[in-house]
């Protein structure tokens, strides 16, 4: 005996008034044929002909869920009871931009969750939001066609000066946050030391505050703040980079000791352990994973094994003392 | 200017051993990881090894490991592979090669070649 | 490990011609700080392999400007703008996102 079987037995389901044996019958015991299953659907039980009763299960495809009640009855009439039921998709498709869009990560298909950022050719700017988001089969917030890039404002205006800064006569003067800064400019994550806070700014009011001598805002990553990895490692960066001997202006960013600026991104990226140089007297005493032995390693390799997020516990500053 | 130039492979039984020298020149060579790559014949590139600073910390790839050894002399500017219980897959020309800030593997030397064969 | 799938395995290509070649990679190569360590190298025969591009697109020092690196995730493109018989040579990519390092099985340039 199994409590799943089911052997046409007739049944009132909570919405029926009627037993099933009391419906009027057409042709008596011929059956059902095979229903025909929503678009990415199939049925499970699949056979040509189902008893009066018998119930046949909606499955959908891969990357795709069922929505509504999955079960069809087969009647004695020969037709089939069914709800509304459909397939769908628990992917988001690559969505379709204008050229000079770039798409990161650049897949076909996004499970639930996953982000995209887009980014525009040097010098200009996405026309609207740059971070989209999967949320059952479709982008959060909605990526319009005619998306495109704009010329950047912050290029515009700064000529031949460092971004923040803008041309007045033959000098370069700091851009004011207030005046300077009421076109749309690209979203930023920040960080302030002086109120140990991250938030969102635009692009134009981080880089204008910075040229004002506003040492304590850190640029974290491009697009809004959100927690996980980026934001957490932004943080763990900051925190990293006081004692950093480097300091090198790179786009938004500072690129600190292990870190390079990457030429065509204006992107601070983490160099890999073997790249760094053993020079410098910035030096830890660490213990790595689930070691118990100490190690010496300079900031440098610290930076790097913090940034590709593998296990390291900080002891102290300056050499081991075994 | 960087050099790097290795030596000591040659024809060698499987079970064998044999070991590969990597000479630096040009740089200042305990400052720098180093690294061995292979290629097998007509085949693509594969990572081997690599070795810090000093020595203290090595890193292999998973068919190499517990039969193959980096390590290094400072004071010679030398790198070496000691390879124990070689296969005939082992068979493949050795790079010694140095990292910059733009790549893990951006300085190569001209290549040993090993061959493992009865 | 990670998986690189170069496309085509070899091409022929007349001087001044422009050319591509594709790197797929089984994972994405994108990590959790929104860094892609995916290299391009070009061995000529008889040489050792020499860095042409590195993180994707930035051009390797000396290198010169016809070689152009783009992509993310898991695809990416090496492009050669205007084909010169130096060009000739076997090209690999390389990733390090993920340990081991790979290295995809190599793209064979010939010059017509």
């Known amino acids: 005996f199994s409590i799943m079987e089911n052997n046409g037995q007739p049944c009132i389901n909570d919405d029926e008034e009627m037993k099933e044996v009391d419906l009027p019958e057409i042709e008596a015991d011929s059956g059902c044929p095979q229903p025909v299953p929503p678009e990415n659907g199939f049925i499970r039980n699949e056979k040509q002909l189902y008893l009066v009763g018998e119930d046949v299960e909606i499955s959908c495809l891969t990357g795709f869920e069922t929505v509504g009640y999955q079960y069809f009855r087969c009647l004695p009439d020969g037709t089939w009871r069914q709800g509304d039921v459909e397939c769908q998709r628990t992917e988001c498709i690559k969505p379709v931009v204008q050229e000079v869009l770039t798409i990161t990560p650049f897949q076909r298909l996004y499970r639930i969750g996953e982000s995209i950022e887009l980014t525009c050719p040097k010098g200009f700017v996405v026309a609207g939001p740059s971070r989209y988001t999967c949320q059952g089969n479709s982008w959060t917030p909605p990526i319009s066609n005619s998306l495109t890039c704009e010329k950047d404002t912050l290029t515009k205006l700064k000529g031949h000066c460092q971004l923040g800064q803008k041309q007045s006569g033959s000098e370069c003067i700091c851009m004011s946050p207030e005046e300077d800064c009421s076109h749309h400019s690209e979203d930023l994550c920040v960080f302030d030391t002086d109120s140990n806070d991250y938030f969102t700014s635009p692009a134009c009011k981080f880089l204008a505050e910075k040229c004002l001598n506003n040492q304590q805002l850190h640029f974290l990553h491009i697009g809004s703040c959100q927690d996980g990895r980026q934001l957490e490692w932004g943080l763990e960066r900051t925190r990293l980079s006081s004692n950093s001997t480097k300091k090198e202006s790179c786009g938004y960013d500072t690129c600190y000791d292990w870190e390079k600026c990457s030429a065509s991104t204006s992107k601070c990226v983490c160099l890999l352990p073997p790249q760094c140089f053993k020079g410098g007297n910035q030096l830890y005493c660490v213990k790595m994973g689930s070691s118990t032995s100490e190690k010496t390693l300079n900031i440098c390799e610290v930076g790097t094994i913090r940034c590709a997020n593998r296990k390291m516990e900080i002891l102290h500053p300056g050499k081991c003392l075994a | 200017e960087v050099q790097l130039v290795e030596s000591g492979g040659g024809l060698v039984q499987p079970g064998g051993s044999l070991r590969l020298s990597c000479v630096a020149s040009?740089?200042?060579?305990?400052?720098?990881?180093m690294a061995w790559v292979r290629q097998a014949p007509g085949k693509g590139l594969e990572w081997v090894a690599t070795i810090n600073y000093d020595g203290s910390s090595t890193y292999y790839r998973e068919s190499v490991k517990g039969r193959f050894t980096i390590s290094r002399d400072n004071a010679k500017n030398t790198l070496y592979l000691q390879m124990d219980s070689l296969r005939a897959e082992d068979t493949a020309v050795y790079y010694c090669?140095?990292?910059?800030?733009?790549?893990?593997?951006?300085?190569w030397g001209q290549g040993t070649l090993v061959t493992v064969s009865s | 490990d990670i998986v690189l799938t170069q496309t085509p395995l070899s091409l022929s290509a007349t001087p001044g011609q422009s050319v591509s070649i594709s790197c797929r990679s089984s994972q994405s190569l994108l990590n959790d700080v929104g860094n892609t360590y995916l290299y391009w190298y070009l061995q000529r025969p008889g040489q050792s392999p020499q860095l042409l591009i590195y993180l994707v697109s930035d051009l390797g020092s000396g290198v010169p400007d016809r070689f152009s690196g783009s992509g993310s995730g898991t695809d990416f493109t090496l492009k050669i703008s205007r084909v010169e018989a130096e060009d000739v040579g076997v090209y690999y990519c390389?990733?390090?996102?993920?340990?081991?390092?790979?290295f995809g099985a190599g793209t064979n340039l010939e010059i017509k």
């Open positions: 390389m990733q390090a996102s993920h340990a081991p390092y790979t």
């Open positions: 040009g740089f200042t060579f305990s400052d720098y990881y």
């Open positions: 090669a140095r990292p910059s800030t733009e790549a893990l593997f951006a300085y």
